[in-house]
């Protein structure tokens, strides 16, 4: 509540997060032309990245392009990319949608289709849909511990969201345990009115808001956080504005003295921790 | 404009960026003692890194030190580093400019020069100039899509910079399309009065400021972003304070059971997205 | 000091950091069943990560799990994890403390102990103490250069912490050189009343606060930063809330066509640079 007689000061904040959980992933794996069902385990080192600050990322889905090499090859025949003669292909042209630089030649992509040849990491990434259901859909059961240290320098006051009295095996619940700072990812989505299983396919951005409304007067001292959750990406976004949340990264290696890479298009949830509030004192 | 009767509240913001573009890089490549011209393609997975929050990085130049191994070798003969006898070399000494720990011996670096031997990743990194022109100078034509979700919790108001009516093939222009949130990197530099080709050599930091001056009163509601650009690193900085923007990272591998690494000194532009402003309501 | 007649505006800030230093690490290395003392050199590419924004991380300690493969194996016999029969092991169960998914079988871990078999990266990570003293304890002598560009858009005023008159070989000292922006890590800890050697074992979070109290009136203009330091993680934290600061990351590779990884549990100091303050003008 607004106490107009108080001197208000915005919060200075530092956040530390720790994700826990294991996912079992089942997917089709092709080796030597034979496709079979492969099972693998993903732990924190596999699905999250060493990140600083007020964000953490959990990979929930992926598409791999294995064994890419820098060479010439036909580009992927996405909508509008096919050609029938070299006239359609412009030497040196980089289509923003494409993955390489055109050589000017129209070459066979497969039995029925021809596309412009490109200088690129080959074979070029297939523009296939993200797997549905998401490969790491069980990330819904992962938990995140959020540690938040806050400071009102003008009032020379410091505190944190985790108190010595707290129980490390708690799970946040809006009603039963609103001060617990261990959150189940699925619960965060539920609180925000979102469906984890659905968002996990294409990825998204979820905001965890920590609001500190602190009365620092000794006679009515109060300074505890209030947690709330809201989705930050636009689920109704037009294709052209890249809906969801994904990024590409590569693992490079050498095979028979040839530089290769595996390209991973990682879909997932980026959690942004947004800390705000004020400290007021007479 | 300042409406003194309004209750003002600072913006809470979340940012998501997506860079697009391909660069063709031509450089001298030495293999088996033979130097020839090498062409390679860099896509987003090669020149940018999975980053969170209000920053993204685009590599525009690099220097590689390939096949480094942990062993003993002469340090690089930079200014003031040469020696004529062991007296000049102090066992256990770590010169902050050097890349290793001295053994105490003065050894030949090449036909004419001797330097202190160090325990280090060998051969030590040559302190050579960043290539000029920059290897990925064509990054000037890359584009970045910026998605910005903002919230005024006290006014319970949320909006974003991308509206459903927007066209995903637009490009920001201060006059013709000031609400488009797809920016050509070269245009950002031009708007800030900077030369991309020049900055790309040593790297730099560019600020993209998004200013929200929101009037949330229903009778005169206005809440759209205004974009502006300014260079954040000091282009006139003294050598000793490390001008430009670069960092080193390594790719580790094993060859004949020996642990090796390729060290990459990456120069590039870090773009900081600085979101600020207030929401006012009667 | 509060000048009530002034129009105050919060600071908009951008930070760039550069760490310097080399560490010599001595540790027991086991190869082919033989354990011997190994010496290695760590430079910036080995102990820090390309990070954006207002944080940087320096690895001070680590535990490695080498040559892990996805297969079945007994889980690590931590407190309460041992079994005597299959009844104790629940097929498909993922214990948050464990590193894999139980198969339902109770199998030998060693001569005397049995644990539940898991599908995991094997052998599973041993829950051993972080090495003491910390392997990179000499990081105390590393230095960090902090560049801070600030902006008061409403007053159209920009400045930075590094002035042209500054000397690039200075080291910050509260009394003798309070404007130098090159900081020895050990000094930061000393200023904050903390013991670097101790914190380096488990890791921690250290805040570097940069306070700008700017009077922008031309007749009494003053705008220089004031640096202060405080520890941000809770050193008295209960085990269940994960004291210190660490994260796991992996290096993946193929050996004899088998996908393997080395898991590194990296302990270290995350430095958060917290910039705050106001610019006031009549």
């Amino acid at each position: 509540s607004d106490k107009l007689y108080q001197r208000k000061e915005p919060v200075i904040s530092s956040v530390h997060t720790k994700v826990k959980g294991i996912a079992e992933v089942t997917e089709n794996v092709t080796e030597g032309g034979v496709t079979k069902l492969g099972h693998s385990i993903f732990d924190t080192a596999d699905y999250t990245f060493p990140l600083q600050g007020n964000s953490f990322f959990v990979m929930t889905n992926y598409v791999k392009s294995e064994g890419q090499v820098q060479t010439l090859c036909p580009e992927y025949p996405r909508r509008g990319a096919q050609c029938s003669s070299d006239r359609r292909c412009k030497k040196g042209w980089m289509d923003p949608q494409s993955k390489g630089i055109q050589t000017g030649r129209c070459v066979p992509y497969d039995k029925t289709r021809k596309t412009c040849e490109v200088s690129a990491w080959c074979p070029t990434e297939e523009e296939k849909e993200a797997p549905r259901p998401a490969l790491l859909r069980s990330a819904e059961n992962f938990t995140v511990l959020i540690k938040n240290n806050i400071h009102f320098p003008g009032h020379n006051y410091t505190t944190r969201n985790i108190l010595p009295t707290m129980n490390g095996s708690c799970t946040f619940h809006k009603t039963w345990d609103p001060q617990c700072s261990i959150f189940r990812l699925g619960d965060i989505f539920q609180e925000a009115g979102e469906n984890f299983t659905e968002v996990a396919v294409q990825g998204g951005i979820m905001g965890i808001e920590i609001y500190w409304d602190c009365n620092l007067d000794s006679w009515s001292h109060h300074c505890r956080p209030r947690y709330s959750f809201r989705r930050l990406d636009d689920k109704n976004m037009d294709e052209s504005f890249v809906p969801g949340y994904n990024f590409r990264y590569a693992k490079y290696y050498k095979e028979n003295n040839v530089e290769k890479r595996t390209l991973i298009k990682a879909f997932g949830i980026r959690f942004d921790i947004l800390v705000f509030g004020t400290g007021g004192k007479f | 404009s300042d409406k003194l009767y309004q209750r003002k509240e600072p913006v809470i913001s979340s940012v998501h960026t997506k860079v697009k573009g391909i660069a063709e890089v031509t450089e001298n490549v030495t293999e088996g003692g033979v130097t020839k011209l090498g062409h390679s393609i860099f896509d987003t997975a090669d020149y940018t890194f999975p980053l969170q929050g209000n920053s993204f990085f685009v590599m525009t130049n690099y220097v590689k030190s390939e096949g480094q191994v942990q062993t003993l070798c002469p340090e690089y003969p930079r200014r003031g580093a040469q020696c004529s006898s062991d007296r000049r070399c102090k066992k256990g000494w770590m010169d902050p400019q050097s890349k290793g720990i001295q053994t105490g011996r003065c050894v030949p670096y090449d036909k004419t020069r001797k330097t202190c031997e160090v325990s280090a990743w060998c051969p030590t990194e040559e302190e050579k100039e960043a290539p000029r022109p920059a290897l990925l100078r064509s990054a000037e034509n890359f584009t970045v899509l910026i998605k910005n979700n903002i919230h005024f919790p006290g006014h319970n108001y949320t909006t974003r910079n991308i509206l459903p009516t927007m066209n995903g093939s637009c490009t920001f222009h201060k006059t013709w399309d000031p609400q488009c949130s797809i920016f050509r990197l070269g245009d950002i530099f031009q708007e800030a009065g900077e030369n991309f080709t020049e900055v790309a050599v040593q790297g730099g930091i560019m600020g993209i400021e998004i200013y929200w001056d929101c009037n949330l009163d229903s009778w005169s509601h206005h809440c759209r972003p205004r974009y502006s650009f300014r260079r954040l690193d000091d282009k006139n900085m003294d050598e000793s304070f490390v001008p430009g923007y670069n960092f080193r990272y390594a790719k580790y591998y094993k060859e004949n059971n020996v642990e090796k690494r390729t060290l990459i000194k990456a120069f590039g532009i870090r773009f900081d997205i600085l979101v600020f402003g207030t929401g006012g309501k009667f | 000091s509060d000048k009530l007649y002034q129009r105050k505006e919060p600071v908009i800030s951008s930070v760039h950091t550069k760490v310097k230093g080399i560490a010599e690490v001595t540790e027991n290395v086991t190869e082919g069943g033989v354990t011997k003392l190994g010496h290695s050199i760590f430079d910036t590419a080995d102990y820090t990560f390309p990070l954006q924004g207002n944080s940087f991380f320096v690895m001070t300690n680590y535990v490695k799990s080498e040559g892990q493969v996805q297969t079945l194996c007994p889980e690590y016999p931590r407190r309460g994890a041992q079994c005597s029969s299959d009844r104790r092991c629940k097929k498909g169960w993922m214990d948050p403390q464990s590193k894999g998914i139980q198969t339902g079988r109770c199998v030998p871990y060693d001569k005397t102990r049995k644990t539940c078999e898991v599908s995991a990266w094997c052998p599973t990570e041993e829950e051993k103490e972080a090495p003491r003293p910390a392997l990179l304890r000499s990081a105390e002598n590393f230095t960090v250069l902090i560049k801070n560009n600030i902006h008061f858009p409403g007053h159209n005023y920009t400045t930075r912490n590094i002035l042209p008159t500054m000397n690039g070989s200075c080291t910050f000292h509260k009394t003798w050189d309070p404007q130098c922006s090159i900081f020895r890590l050990g000094d930061i800890f000393q200023e904050a009343g903390e013991n670097f050697t101790e914190v380096a074992v488990q890791g921690g979070i250290m805040g570097i606060e940069i306070y700008w109290d700017c009077n922008l009136d031309s007749w009494s203009h003053h705008c220089r930063p004031r640096y202060s330091f405080r520890r941000l993680d809770d050193k008295n934290m209960d085990e269940s809330f994960v004291p210190g600061y660490n994260f796991r990351y992996a290096k993946y590779y193929k050996e004899n066509n088998v996908e393997k990884r080395t898991l590194i549990k990296a302990f270290g100091i995350r430095f958060d640079i917290l910039v705050f303050g106001t610019g006031g003008k009549f």
């Epitope: - | - | 079945l72 194996c73 007994p74 079988r105 094997c122």
Partner: nanobody, 115 residues
Framework: EVQLVESRGGLVQAGGSLRLSCAAS?????MGWFRQAPGKEREFVAG????????RYADSVKSRFTISRDNAKNTVSLQMSGLKPEDTAIYYC???????????WGQGTQVTVSS
């Protein structure tokens, strides 16, 4: 430290069969076999987890060699059939923490396949 004792190897005609066995001084999760041919590095042959789950074979011996173990006796055996001259090597029994990871090796036993 685990002690391992392998059975005697022998000389076999190409196309013939041979069975190797090995006893461990204590129970371990995995037991397996490696081999080293003259002038070559030691290579993995076959491995078995607890109760024979899982099993793993080198590509070169798949469908010709079979590994089996007896948990109660802490033993493992390798049934080799369709032997080829290139199978000639010293065969080592090993124990470890998974079918990919081995810490202790026996003294080795010579197997020679003549053409």
């Amino acid at each position: 430290e685990v002690q391992l004792v392998e059975s005697r190897g022998g000389l076999v005609q190409a196309g013939g069969s041979l069975r190797l066995s090995c006893a461990a001084s204590e129970r371990t999760y995995s037991m397996g076999w490696f081999r080293q041919a003259p002038g070559k590095e030691r290579e993995f042959v076959a491995g078995s987890g607890w109760d024979g789950i899982p099993t793993r074979y080198a590509d070169s011996v798949k469908s010709r060699f079979t590994i089996s173990r007896d948990n109660a006796k802490n033993t493992v055996s390798l049934q080799m059939s369709g032997l080829k001259p290139e199978d000639t090597a010293i065969y080592y029994c090993a124990t470890g923490t998974s079918v990919y990871h081995y810490q202790y090796w026996g003294q080795g036993t010579q197997v020679t396949v003549s053409s």
